[in-house]
């Protein structure tokens, strides 16, 4: 296994607007210029892909237009933001990093960030 160490925070609390941000940092053994980052969500022992992007070092991550993710890169760090989260989206979000170019190829998978999402309380009706 072409394992590479990936670090990410253990816990993140989403904002009241359903936005969660965390940093995914990888210890690159090579001199990669093009990197693929995938965010996976693990819940109830099922793993699903949330979003993915391949980026050139020093450039912004370009996710698909309809993606709920955005991100920026700086060196071996990727700053990921996931938006549109609701309480039901609470779960473990795993950062997967692949060094795609040039060879050698390396793969790293973080331990996951537990993102807690609390739906905001509806505003009470006002008599004023």
């Amino acid at each position: 296994c072409k394992a590479m160490h990936v670090a990410q925070p253990a816990v993140v609390l989403a904002s009241s607007r359903g936005i969660a941000s965390f940093v995914c940092e990888y210890a690159s053994p090579g001199k990669a210029t093009e990197v693929r980052v995938t965010v996976l969500r693990q819940a109830d022992s099922q793993v699903t892909e949330v979003c993915a992007a391949t980026y050139m070092m020093g450039n912004e991550l370009t996710f698909l237009d309809d993606s709920i993710c955005t991100g920026t890169s700086s060196g071996n760090q990727v700053n990921l933001t996931i938006q549109g989260l609701r309480a039901m989206d609470t779960g473990l979000y795993i950062c997967k990093v692949e060094l795609m170019y040039p060879p050698p190829y390396y793969l790293g998978i973080g331990n996951g960030t537990q993102i807690y999402v609390i739906d905001p309380e509806p505003c009470p009706d006002s008599d004023f």
Epitope: E34, A52, P102, P104
Partner: antibody
């Protein structure tokens, strides 16, 4: 199904040029580096070059330097090989191959190029 | 560039024989504990097929009679009991650095 399909082969005159295409399907083309490899009749596999996932970087084997150009159009899921100043020794089957997890995990079926007058 | 030298260039064997092919690199193809050396099988008129990746990992769907070993500069592909469908040409390739390079191939023929 993940596949690569080459096209554009055929008979070419010595001194001429060829442009081969490699159409990808079944995977996110823009995530992968792709290579061209060729095989002359009865000979071994020979690496021609590679293009990075974005298309921003290419690298060629020394013997093809200055005579070959690899390009890609990620919006069309297509890879190209342009080879100029063709000679009889360029007669070969040309393959495109995906560099998946550090190895060639998907190959095209190959397209035969014959250089002859 | 890393040169790969395979031996023998051809061999004749019978069904049931144990066959060993070696691949020697001009410099180490190891990096951070991984050997970036892979083995392919090719039959006439067909594209190469991956057998072994990272020197010793068996590709999914490949029979267990195929195995790979080695590290650094010296690698071996072994077919424990040759089957009729194994008569083909075998190539090693290094994917540590560009340019990628192939061995010259080993043709396994029927004795």
């Amino acid at each position: 199904e993940v596949q690569l399909v080459e096209s554009g082969g055929g008979l070419v005159q010595p001194g001429g040029s060829l442009r081969l295409s490699c159409a990808a399907s079944g995977f996110t083309f823009s995530d992968y580096a792709i290579h061209w490899v060729r095989q002359a009749p009865g000979k071994g596999l020979e690496w021609i070059g590679i293009i990075s996932p974005s298309g921003g970087s290419t690298k060629y084997a020394q013997k093809f330097q200055g005579r070959v150009t690899i390009s890609r159009d990620n919006s069309k899921n297509t890879l190209y090989l342009q080879l100029n100043s063709l000679r009889a020794e360029d007669t070969a089957v040309y393959y495109c191959a995906r560099l998946g997890y550090g190895y060639f995990d998907v190959w095209g079926q190959g397209t035969l190029v014959t250089v002859s007058s | 560039d890393i040169q790969l030298t395979q031996s023998p260039s051809s061999l004749s064997a019978s069904v049931g024989d144990r066959v060993t092919i070696t691949c020697r690199a001009s410099q180490s193809v190891d990096f951070y504990g991984i050997s970036f050396l892979h083995w392919y099988q090719q039959k006439p008129g067909k594209a190469p097929k991956l057998l072994i990746y990272d020197a010793s990992s068996l590709e999914s769907g490949v029979p267990s009679r195929f195995s790979g070993s080695g590290s650094g500069t010296d690698f071996t592909l072994t077919i424990s009991s040759l089957q009729p469908e194994d008569f083909a040409t075998y190539y090693c390739v290094q994917a540590l650095q560009l340019p990628l390079t192939f061995g010259q191939g080993t043709k396994v023929e029927i004795k």
